[in-house]
Structure formats: structure tokens, C-alpha cells
Interface confidence: low
């Protein structure tokens, strides 16, 4: 299969015969890489290209979310003949090139992982010397970030008919299960869960009616650990008050 393409920037006629793998563009990435929040992860990406002895200027790029259009998280450029790819962009300073693009390796290290890093990443290389060519992985590599639960918000809010309700929001991956306990609730009450408020790792559980003063505890648990937070409800002379207390337990 032969393709002929006019490069509009250089107005060069490129003809390429697809014969052996060494003479074609391809990118090799794993389907998924898994790592824990707070740790580092390596996103492997190697490529082949048809320009056998290319040593001109090149740019290595990683983007997140969507191929071709997603925001860049890392970019570096290597001058003609140079083995050093000078970093031009590293989002929050947490992305570092591990591979050598001159050796067809764009592998990237991501430091200090957060749950927000859990998304798909796409590697891209651009040649910009005598040859003008570029290639980007279409499917990319999914970075799966795991994390023990963390309760990020617990609060008491006015409810209907002068009652009160409690809300507990936690994050974690796998998404944690939430349970309330407290006065006259017994252990592990049937809280009303409402998952995914704006982010796939967030889980919210509501306790619709707090009928007694005292300590109400929200527990979040997944396979990696559990976290607890409490809110104290007390009412006097028609007013009310609340205070909170957090406990985190991680399984290692």
C-alpha cells in the first residue's frame, strides 16, 4: 500500500512504501499502567519510523485526555544531532522524560501521583528538519491511580421542618463505600449515596434526618484502607452547633 501526501508547510512530495515494520510509523504503548497515589509511575512509549537515519530537530510531546486535542502535560525539544531533549513544559514540574527520543523511546515518568492524574495519556513525536513528519498514539495509555479513602468534607446542614441533615464526601480508588453511624442509628446506617459529583473518584452519602444530639461518624472504606470523620450535633434554645473530627486508617 503506497501513500502519497503533500506536506503543505514544506510543499514536499512524500512517498512511502509500507514494507517492513522498521519502515513504518508505529507506536507501542501498554493499555494500562497502575500506580498508587503519592507514588511515581512510568508511562512507556516506544516508536518506529520510516526515516532511518533522522538526526534533525525533534519534539517529544505528551498530552492528556484526548489524542491530538488534549492539553499538553510535557514537551521537550532536541536540536539537530543532540541526544538531549530540553524540557519546555512539565506540568506542575511532575513529568520527566525517561526515554531517549533519539533511541525511539518517549517513556515518561510522572511523580507524586494524585487521583486527578487518573486519565489517558498520548505520546507524540515531531520531526522538523529536512523531514517534516509527526506521529501520535491514537489510543494512548490509561494511567490508573489507586488511593485509600480520604474524607474531604463532612458537614451538618439545615433540613426540612427544623431538622438537620449530614453530608459526607470522600474520595478514593476504588471508589469507597460510605456508612454513617450515630445516636439511634445503630452501626452502619443506610445512608443515601450519590456517586460521582463532578469526578469519578468522589462519593457522597447523605444522612437525611439527624433526630438526636451527639456524635455522627462517617466511615469510608475500600480495599486499600478506611477513613473516618465525625460531626457533633448539639441543639440548645432553638440554635444548633457542630464540630468535626477526622481519623484515617490505611492498609499497607
Amino acid at each position: 500500500f503506497v501513500r502519497t501526501k503533500i506536506d503543505t508547510t514544506e510543499n514536499l512530495l512524500n512517498t512511502e512504501v509500507h514494507s517492513s515494520p522498521a519502515q513504518r510509523w508505529s507506536m507501542q504503548v501498554p493499555a494500562e499502567v497502575s500506580a498508587a497515589a503519592g507514588d511515581a509511575a512510568v508511562l512507556p512509549c516506544t516508536f518506529t519510523h520510516p526515516h532511518r537515519h533522522y538526526d534533525g530537530p525533534l519534539t517529544a510531546i505528551w498530552r492528556a485526555g484526548e489524542p491530538y486535542a488534549g492539553p499538553q502535560v510535557f514537551r521537550c525539544a532536541a536540536a539537530r544531532g543532540s541526544e538531549l531533549c530540553q524540557t519546555a513544559l512539565s506540568l506542575h514540574g511532575r513529568f520527566r522524560l525517561l526515554g531517549n527520543p533519539r533511541r525511539n523511546d518517549l517513556s515518561l515518568r510522572v511523580e507524586r501521583l494524585a487521583l486527578a492524574d487518573d486519565r489517558r495519556y498520548f505520546c507524540r513525536v515531531e520531526f522538523a528538519g529536512d523531514v517534516h513528519d509527526r506521529y501520535e498514539s491514537r489510543h494512548g495509555v490509561r494511567l490508573h491511580v489507586t488511593a485509600a479513602p480520604r474524607i474531604i468534607n463532612i458537614s451538618v446542614l439545615p433540613g426540612p421542618a427544623h431538622a438537620f441533615r449530614a453530608l459526607c464526601t470522600a474520595e478514593g480508588e476504588p471508589p469507597p463505600a460510605l456508612a454513617w453511624s450515630g445516636p439511634a442509628l445503630g452501626n452502619g446506617s443506610a445512608a443515601v449515596p450519590s456517586s460521582g459529583q463532578g469526578h469519578g473518584h468522589l462519593v457522597t452519602a447523605e444522612l437525611p434526618a439527624l433526630n438526636h444530639d451527639g456524635r455522627y461518624t462517617c466511615t469510608a472504606a475500600n480495599s486499600l484502607g478506611r477513613s473516618e470523620a465525625s460531626v457533633y450535633l448539639f441543639r440548645f434554645h432553638g440554635a444548633s452547633g457542630a464540630s468535626t473530627h477526622h481519623h484515617h486508617h490505611h492498609h499497607h
Epitope: 500500500f1 501526501k5 512524500n14 513504518r24 510509523w25 506521529y135
Partner: antibody, heavy 122, light 106 residues
Amino acid sequence: QVQLQQSGAELVRPGTSVQMSCKAAGYTFTNYWIGWVKQRPGHGLEWVGDIHPGINYTNNNEKFRGKATLTADTSSSTAYMQLRGLTSDDSAIYYCARVDYDYDGSYIMDYWGQGTSVTVSS
Amino acid sequence: QIILSQSPALLSASPGEKVTMTCRASSSVSYMYWYQQKPGSSPKPWIYATSNLTSGVPARFSGSGSGTSYSLTISRVEAEDAATYFCQQWNSKPWTFGGGSRLEIR
């Protein structure tokens, strides 16, 4: 030369399953994606999903999740698609196609099989 | 998903005439791809990355466009061009096709 040979026509009952094959020849099977496309008269072409035999990674059109399962056997350079829970809406010609790159990192289905006709009827 | 709408659904032309068919995307795409299909045959890749002809496609065919509007033009139609032409996008999943434009030669 590159060839994709698909299995023969199928006449199946509603509620049953069917598996069709797509045997690749003339290129390195593990270097390219294989895409599957559904064609019903009056409905144009519909992408079902694709599979990369080299990294055993599949991509499915959400519409066909639970309906289509894509697999590949690298030893025989054959891709398979299984359709389950068949209804009359699944009556169609199903094509496999090799997915090749172009210079911009986008893709094109450059070689197509001859198609497998599936008729769902009681 | 990105919906591709092709028009006209049916074109009728005499040999030597110029014909243009369009493909409109519901949201912007980087490139458009075109396939030709004749009755009883599989689709064939015809134009890739908006304007590039695949090997063996006659030079009377051309593709153009950007954003949400793309077109395929045949400068001088020949009898062998009678077929259905489908546009397709690889911009975002699910990859989608247009409903097709069928070209008849009078």
C-alpha cells in the same frame, strides 16, 4: 499482498450468538489494528470496535458494549467478533478492516474483508 | 458522539460534469476521510486526511474542507465513478461515518 478473508454467511435464530472470523495475510498481524464495521441497508456504516492483536487492547463503540466481543489469535493471524443476544437489528453485513496510520497520526481503514452477512430470523 | 451528515443523499450526473458532495460534522474535526463503495463490494479507502488521495485513486478526485464542513469533488465524472461515497472521522470516539452520498451516472 494484504488480504482479509472473512467467514461465510450466517442464518441464526433470535436470542442466540454468532462468531465470525477475519483471517489476515500478507502483513505482520501484530503491527496493526483490526476494525469491525456494521452495514445495514439504509443505515450506512457503523464502527463496532477495534482490536490491536500486538498489545491485546480493544476499543468498543459504547453502543455495542455487551453486544460485541472482539478477540484475536496471533498464532493464526485471525481476528474474531462474537455477537450475542441477537435480534433483527443485528441483521447486517459485518466487515473487518485493517487500520493503518497516515503521516499525521490519524488512521484509515486501508484493507477490508469481503464482509460476513448475518441474518437473524426465526 | 460526532454526527456526520452527507448531502445530497443522491446525485445524478452526466459524464464530464463536475460534482461535489458535502459532509457536515456536528462538531469540529481535524480531518475527514472518504470511502468509496460499489454495490456488492466492500468499501475502499478513497481520500485520507481531508485532501490526500489513496494509491490508485484518479486525480480527478479531490477533497477539501476544515472544521465542520468538508467536501469531495470530482472534476469530470466518468461512468466508473458510480458508487456511494461515505465520509468518516477519527477525531473522537466513537469513530463515525456519514450516511453516504450515492452517485448515479446518467
